[in-house]
């Protein structure tokens, strides 16, 4: 039964169990052609060297062919994400062949043994593909391997072993343990297909990382930084999911990669965009919302092939459920001066007003200290499409950095009760939409009144498209 720390603990246990516990099973990999969207339909099993099932089951040689490859399993059953993905692929690509690679007997093992079985399963898939290539009209370029967790590395092996080059491999949160830092031939890598795209949703820099942290594809997408996924916190899970344990948090975050991919198939009109960035912190600061030189891309099925750069790390924020799309904004706020700020660190809040909708009050996450007489960059995202932005309401609060600073503030206030209030001077806000790439400048509604005290609000209206300001006098360094 699960350890108190769920799959993380179980996986740690699995890594240290003696070999003797392993169940004896006959090595077996089956290929199930899903001939119906109905998940209860038994489908058709393909057999290497036997052409009749291909004909009987209506295998379309000229169409796209998807191979779905599951990962390690503790229960030995196909989990419910599988039929969701099968159905989504059938919905999106009606003529496609959707094949489920059933390697359950080899995956329902100690984790270490399942890892050791990935190579043989990859080899079985490669042999199946080599045989299909002998058929007229079948093209390896039309093959898309979709591997979840351990299955992503199986896909890598398959791509490595096959004669020729597979069109695409999508890695859905490729497994981390025993693959992190491994040689490129022993894990999923960009060499394994013409295009390798990867979604990382459960990475941890501390403890056991169920998903691989390192980039392993042509593009590696880290939704929400690749770690804590919205809707998967313990509170969310206790309220809305089965079991309501740490186990379920892990499952929720790890499996989120599958649901993001399903979302990209079924919500074609609501594509999520990711933005190239060197690391998560820089993305959180809002400085990576560029689409120039292939720096942004759709995620999941709609990702555009990018082979010019290897290991391009990309980031985005998402909602807690389908459709996952959010709207990203970069906000540049130039703080001209502090007044009586002491040791207080301001926290900004903005409300965005648009032609379609208005946002909630959104906190601006502070990644680094807010600089005085400098431009501070923030990332803001909304779940709704606000349309064209019209105005922005800004407020701020003082958040003390420590109890000692709080005491100093209080003592200072008590000794100088008539000390004028703390103020910030902000004259404009520059906004860039990640999704539309539009740049807008918002100026203080009252140019004579640009100082703002904690809890007060300052209104900014759109004053021009673009960011370049003409005839501007400023006592400080100007933005490029």
């Amino acid at each position: 039964s699960p350890t108190p720390f769920g799959p993380e603990g179980q996986l740690a246990d699995e890594l240290h169990k003696p070999k003797a516990i392993q169940t004896e099973v006959k090595p077996s990999v089956r290929f199930n052609l899903r001939t119906s969207k109905d998940p209860e339909h038994e489908g058709c099993y393909l057999s290497l060297g036997h052409s009749q099932p291909l004909e009987d089951c209506g295998f379309n040689m000229t169409a796209k062919t998807f191979f779905i490859i599951h990962g390690w399993t503790m229960s030995g059953i196909f989990e419910n994400w599988l039929h969701k993905l099968v159905s989504a692929l059938h919905t999106r690509e009606k003529d496609a062949n959707v094949v489920v690679v059933d390697w359950l007997p080899l995956a329902h093992q100690l984790y270490t043994d399942a890892v050791n079985n990935t190579r043989v399963v990859g080899h079985s898939i490669a042999r199946m593909l080599d045989w299909l290539q002998e058929k007229d009209d079948f093209s390896l370029g039309n093959v898309h391997l979709i591997g979840y967790s351990l299955g992503a590395h199986v896909a890598g092996y398959a791509g490595n072993f096959v004669k020729g080059t597979v069109g695409r491999i999508t890695g859905l949160d490729p497994a981390g343990p025993m693959f992190e830092g491994a040689d490129i031939h022993k894990r999923l890598s960009p060499d394994d297909a013409d295009f390798v795209d990867v979604l990382h949703t459960y990475t941890r820099s501390f403890g056991l990382s169920i998903g691989i942290q390192m980039p392993v594809g042509h593009i590696d997408i880290y939704p929400n930084g690749g770690d804590f996924q919205p809707g998967c916190g313990l509170n969310d899970v206790l309220g809305s999911m089965a079991y309501g344990t740490i186990t379920e948090v892990v499952k929720c975050e790890h499996e989120r990669a599958v649901h993001l991919f399903v979302d990209s198939l079924v919500n074609q009109d609501k594509p999520s965009f990711a933005f190239q960035c060197t690391d998560s912190n820089r993305f959180k600061k809002g400085i990576c919302l560029s689409c120039r030189k292939n720096r942004c891309n759709s995620i999941g099925y709609n990702a555009k092939k990018m082979r010019n750069k290897r290991n391009s790390k990309m980031y985005l924020k998402t909602r807690a459920g389908m459709p996952f799309r959010v709207y990203h904004y970069q906000m540049k706020i130039h703080v001209f001066s502090y007044k009586n700020m002491g040791e207080i660190e301001p926290t900004f809040y903005v409300t965005l007003y648009g032609t379609n909708a208005d946002s909630q009050t959104l906190p601006l996450e502070i990644v680094e200290r807010i600089e005085q007489n400098a431009t501070n960059t923030f990332l803001v995202y909304t779940e709704e499409d606000l349309g064209d932005l019209l105005k922005i309401q800004l407020t701020w609060e003082g958040a003390s950095q420590s109890w000692y600073n709080l005491w100093k503030e209080l003592r200072s206030y008590l000794s100088q009760p008539h000390n004028p209030g703390r103020e910030l001077n902000i004259r404009r806000i520059r906004v860039k939409s990640g999704e539309t790439q539009r740049k807008l400048t918002f100026c203080a509604e009252d140019p004579e009144n640009t100082s703002i005290s904690p809890g007060r609000e300052l209104w900014f209206r759109k004053c021009r498209d673009g960011w370049r300001m003409k005839n501007e006098t400023s006592p400080t360094v100007e933005l490029p």
């Epitope: 209860e40 059953i77 329902h108 999911m241 079991y243």
Partner: antibody
């Protein structure tokens, strides 16, 4: 049509071993998992576990680990439940029921049940 | 393990009236928009028979007077109008991703 036919009722002494069968017909045996469910007299249903009919790998519920064993004779499309060291509390009707590997795991076809009774 | 609690344990309903059976799960059985709750009917001396799967889907061949609803932890089986042949014990069952797949304690329906 799809059918699951189980072996007949048996009277067993405590300590004995009993093996009941479930023969499937009307579908490809290895394409569906097989469950075993216990129902004590006048009581509700209790899931015992299941067996992967292709690989032969069994999974047991916690209360049925140890004395209970699931097995297969694939060529005969038959699943078996063996109970070792039969006890009085094993007196019950045992059902086999199939489920789809690819779907939502509900039990769509059931055997007629095999009644096992402990004889003193 | 997920515990399913059915209520009432037994009920008597007049012919043509509505029978409502409740099933409460100790934790949610929802997953990505679906509820993994099933309902079975069992008559004395017979095996259980699937009526409803995934909370509200009627198995083919089952009369439309049977319907299922609910999500999360609260589920209901409705039979309307009740007929003589509906006298039986009804069980709910959850089949989430992680076995054990548990059953409720059962509800015995009598026809008045």
């Amino acid at each position: 049509q799809i059918q699951l036919v189980q072996s007949g009722p048996e009277l067993k002494k405590p300590g004995e071993t009993v093996k009941i069968s479930c023969k499937a017909s009307g579908y490809t045996f290895t394409n569906y998992g097989m469950n075993w469910v216990k129902q004590a007299p006048g009581k509700g249903l209790k899931w015992m576990g299941w067996i992967n009919t292709y690989s032969g790998v069994p999974t047991y519920a916690d209360d049925f680990k140890g004395r209970f064993a699931f097995s297969l004779e694939t060529s005969a499309s038959t699943a078996y439940l063996q109970i070792n060291n039969f006890k009085n509390e094993d007196t019950a009707t045992y059902f086999c029921a199939r489920f789809s590997y690819y779907g939502r795991h509900y039990f769509d076809y059931w055997g007629q049940g095999t009644a096992l009774t402990a004889s003193s | 393990d997920i515990v399913l609690t059915q209520s009432p344990a037994s009920l008597a309903v007049s012919l043509g009236q509505r029978a409502t059976i409740s099933c409460k799960a100790s934790q949610s059985v929802d997953y990505d928009g679906d509820s993994y709750m099933n309902w079975y009917q069992q008559k004395p001396g017979q095996p259980p028979k699937l009526l409803i799967y995934a909370a509200s889907n009627l198995k083919s061949g089952i009369p439309a007077r049977f319907s299922g609803s609910g999500s999360g932890t609260d589920f209901t089986l409705n039979i309307h109008p009740v007929e003589e042949e509906d006298a039986a014990t009804y069980y709910c069952q959850q089949t989430t991703d992680d076995p054990p797949w548990t059953f409720g304690g059962g509800t015995k329906l009598e026809i008045k």
